[in-house]
């Protein structure tokens, strides 16, 4: 053991350092004192600390610890906050574009339906937005309401345009007939499947991101216990009492202290890991019918096809509806039946699709890659904080909480600490109530993420075939085939170059096929941070 340095006979250095923490010198002894009243920095000889100084050191130590914890989580916090904001905004843009595409489709192909169609489409997409943000709305009801509302207008404007005003009280009958006669074929059911699956995933994705922010905010603002404050004081400040101003704590000793102080926080680790992995699984499955960008931006095409399906079967339908709603309609009027030869051969139709170059899906994958680098965030916190606070390299000539040592011995330090206060007891207390609450929330979201009906490998393709969402050749039931038709195949180019699109509304006049398309760009996820900025130069 090296000889102790000569004591500071006047406590001058201690006085000048302490004055930076607490203006005024009334608490600092002018010369070393016995220090019998000290409770944390137990002296082995004369000391330059008083009980009041010790209390101030404890307060400062806890504040430093809180700031270190906040700076440690800053990069992660910034990452999730920025992305939660971007995705929420981008999803709103997708909904807005989908609405505008659908309105443009009605305006271009069915101008006679537009006033009412715009209203129904608007209500539908408002519900979509509310659902994504967490409202308790049933997706099937939303889709049913859209088609229930559209059919009476289609019947009276397209199929029976000569219908006099006196016969317009058949709306309720037509709404009922829409479902009973399956006038839109299987299209409503297909849209329900697509929309409900993609929106469900989108909604839980946003919920998960927002919970991520809540987790970080919770652990970011933890108040450390008095026991922890004492341990930190011994590590960071008790050396000053002996006049050892330039001595740094031993690295191994710091790790022991931090593990004790952060025992509760580290319990989050297991659930945090699961959160990131479950979120990754969710994101990996967010494509095709599980990708709202793909589904919603292609919805106008499916709705268009559903109306064409009605028109194709207009002859049969008008006869049946004429009988079904006879009490409301005295006679049949001129049918606007569209002959078969007006239809494009469905074999050559392709599903209108969204080009994914640098779209939301690529940004989601980038986010997951960044998040995965934080998978050990909570378990690594004690070591991380030690590496970002002053510690002696190689554990040589360092402070072990009691004295200056040439080499750190964990056993000796643990024994010394246990004499002062029980480190084991500190660990056994269990996590704080706020930590327990956040663990419960993580468990819940992890369960939701796991139980999402997500595609697993090749099963996805099978499901898509069954549900009719594959592009390319149609299935056996050609009436149910999905494809862009009318004015030809409409290719929906990705509109979500984020900077250009945030706060941008596509005008209804811009038909999806004719609008100028922005070229997507590579959007990097940024995670700038400022670690260890405990004494910020900013006020």
């Amino acid at each position: 053991q090296p000889p102790p340095p000569p004591p500071d006979a006047t406590c001058h250095q201690v006085r000048s350092f302490f004055q930076r923490l607490q203006p005024g010198l009334k608490w600092v002894p002018e010369t070393p004192v016995p220090g019998s009243d000290l409770q944390v920095c137990l002296p082995k000889g004369p000391t330059c600390c008083s009980r009041k100084m010790e209390e101030k050191y404890q307060l400062t130590a806890r504040l430093n610890m809180e700031q270190l914890l906040q700076s440690a989580s800053m990069e992660l916090k910034f990452l999730i906050i920025q992305n939660a904001a971007v995705f929420q905004e981008a999803f709103e843009i997708v909904v807005r574009h989908a609405k505008n595409y659908t309105n443009a489709m009605f305006k271009n192909n069915y101008p006679s339906l537009t006033p009412q169609a715009f209203e129904f489409v608007g209500e539908f997409f408002t519900d979509v937005s509310l659902y994504i943000l967490g409202s308790d709305i049933n997706v099937d009801d939303m889709v049913n309401e859209l088609f229930d509302s559209l059919f009476p207008v289609i019947y009276t404007q397209l199929m029976n345009p000569g219908l006099p005003d006196s016969a317009l009280d058949i709306n309720e009958c037509l709404r009922g007939a829409r479902r009973d006669l399956k006038v839109f074929g299987n299209f409503p059911k297909l849209i329900m499947t697509q929309v409900s699956k993609s929106l469900q995933v989108t909604r839980i994705f946003l919920q998960a991101l927002n919970l991520g922010i809540e987790v970080i905010n919770t652990t970011d603002h933890l108040k450390f216990s008095k026991d922890c404050g004492r341990m930190l004081t011994r590590m960071w400040y008790c050396s000053y009492c002996q006049g050892l101003m330039m001595v740094k704590p031993c690295g191994g000793y710091c790790n022991v202290v931090m593990q004790g102080c952060m025992a509760g926080v580290v319990e989050i680790d297991k659930y945090w890991r699961e959160y990131i992995l479950s979120l990754e699984e969710l994101v990996n499955g967010m494509y095709r019918i599980y990708d709202m960008e793909n589904v919603l931006l292609g919805l106008f095409s499916t709705i268009h096809d559903s109306i064409q399906y009605v028109q194709k079967n207009a002859g049969k339908l008008t006869t049946t509806i004429g009988k079904l709603c006879a009490h409301s309609q005295q006679r049949q009027y001129r049918s606007a039946y569209y002959p078969e030869d007006l239809f494009i051969d469905k074999k050559v139709l392709k599903v209108a699709h969204v080009e994914h170059e640098e779209t939301l899906s690529s940004r989601r994958r980038e986010l997951i890659q960044k998040l995965k680098s934080f998978i050990s965030f909570y378990s690594a916190l004690p070591g991380y904080i030690c590496s970002h606070s002053p510690v002696a390299e190689n554990d040589t000539l360092c402070w072990n909480g009691q004295e200056l040592v040439e080499r750190y011995s964990q056993k000796a330090a643990r024994n010394g600490m246990k004499n002062q206060f029980n480190l084991h007891e500190l660990k056994m207390k269990g996590p704080e109530p706020v930590v327990s609450q956040i663990i419960d929330k993580l468990k819940h979201i992890n369960q939701l993420l796991r139980t999402m009906s997500m595609p697993k490998g090749r099963v996805l393709d099978k499901n898509l075939d069954e549900e009719g969402f594959e592009s390319g050749d149609c299935g056996d039931d050609e009436d149910e085939c999905i494809g862009g038709s009318g004015d030809g195949m409409i290719k929906v180019k990705n509109q979500l170059r984020f900077l250009a699109e945030l706060a941008y509304d596509l005008d209804v006049d811009d038909a999806p096929g004719n609008s100028q398309q922005a070229t997507p760009k590579d959007n990097e996820i940024s995670t700038f941070h400022n670690l260890g900025n405990v004494h910020s130069p900013l006020k």
Epitope: M74, E75, I81, Q82, N83, F498, L502, I525, F528, P537
Partner: antibody, heavy 125, light 110 residues
Framework: EVQLLESGGGLVQPGGSLRLSCAAS????????MSWVRQAPGKGLEWVSG????????YYADSVKGRFTISRDNSKNTLYLQMNSLRAEDTAVYYC??????????????????WGQGTLVTVSS | QSVLTQPPSASGTPGQRVTISCTGS????????VNWYQQLPGTAPKLLIY???KRPSGVPDRFSGSKSGTSASLAISGLRSEDEADYYC???????????FGGGTKLTVL
Amino acid sequence: EVQLLESGGGLVQPGGSLRLSCAASGFTFSSYSMSWVRQAPGKGLEWVSGISPSGGNKYYADSVKGRFTISRDNSKNTLYLQMNSLRAEDTAVYYCARALLGCKSAYCYYAMDVWGQGTLVTVSS
Amino acid sequence: QSVLTQPPSASGTPGQRVTISCTGSSSNIGSNAVNWYQQLPGTAPKLLIYADSKRPSGVPDRFSGSKSGTSASLAISGLRSEDEADYYCGSWDSSLSGYVFGGGTKLTVL
């Protein structure tokens, strides 16, 4: 005193390369994100690139992506900007700046609180 | 063209109060804090206001910042001749994953 000192600017031909350095002093360099910001003659400020404290994460403005590379050597307290395939429009005074980041709840700020005096890069034939 | 929009010039007489505006979008000012920088002729920029309204130490309280929605303002009260400079607003842009500046406002003290 907190200081940043840029060097390495000069005249270079279009298509050429240049490496800027920024020496930091008076603060714990390894604890801060750093950025490069440029200002073309008579024009406004343009953020060019940024790097996280460890140097693990690097970010670029679209205008320089693929041509410029930011890096840092924490042992030397130095920030670098390697500029390749230089164009006339890259002519500017290049400043290195220390970045501060803070988040409260779900609201963040990113501010550049310390700036160097700048180094002039001229790209001309 | 700058992502954030500022008026190119502003002016005032000594002692007056001058306000400079900065308009952005939901991805920058709408979701992140705004900072203001002062650049005196021939010198490097200096941080004047950060986190919408906070002043770094050494910045006089004549300078104040505010924000509402996707717009921010810098107010200078008791205008002095030494305040003649270019003023830039800046903010993190969540969508671009980068920092964006306004085009700058040249303040003239008449």
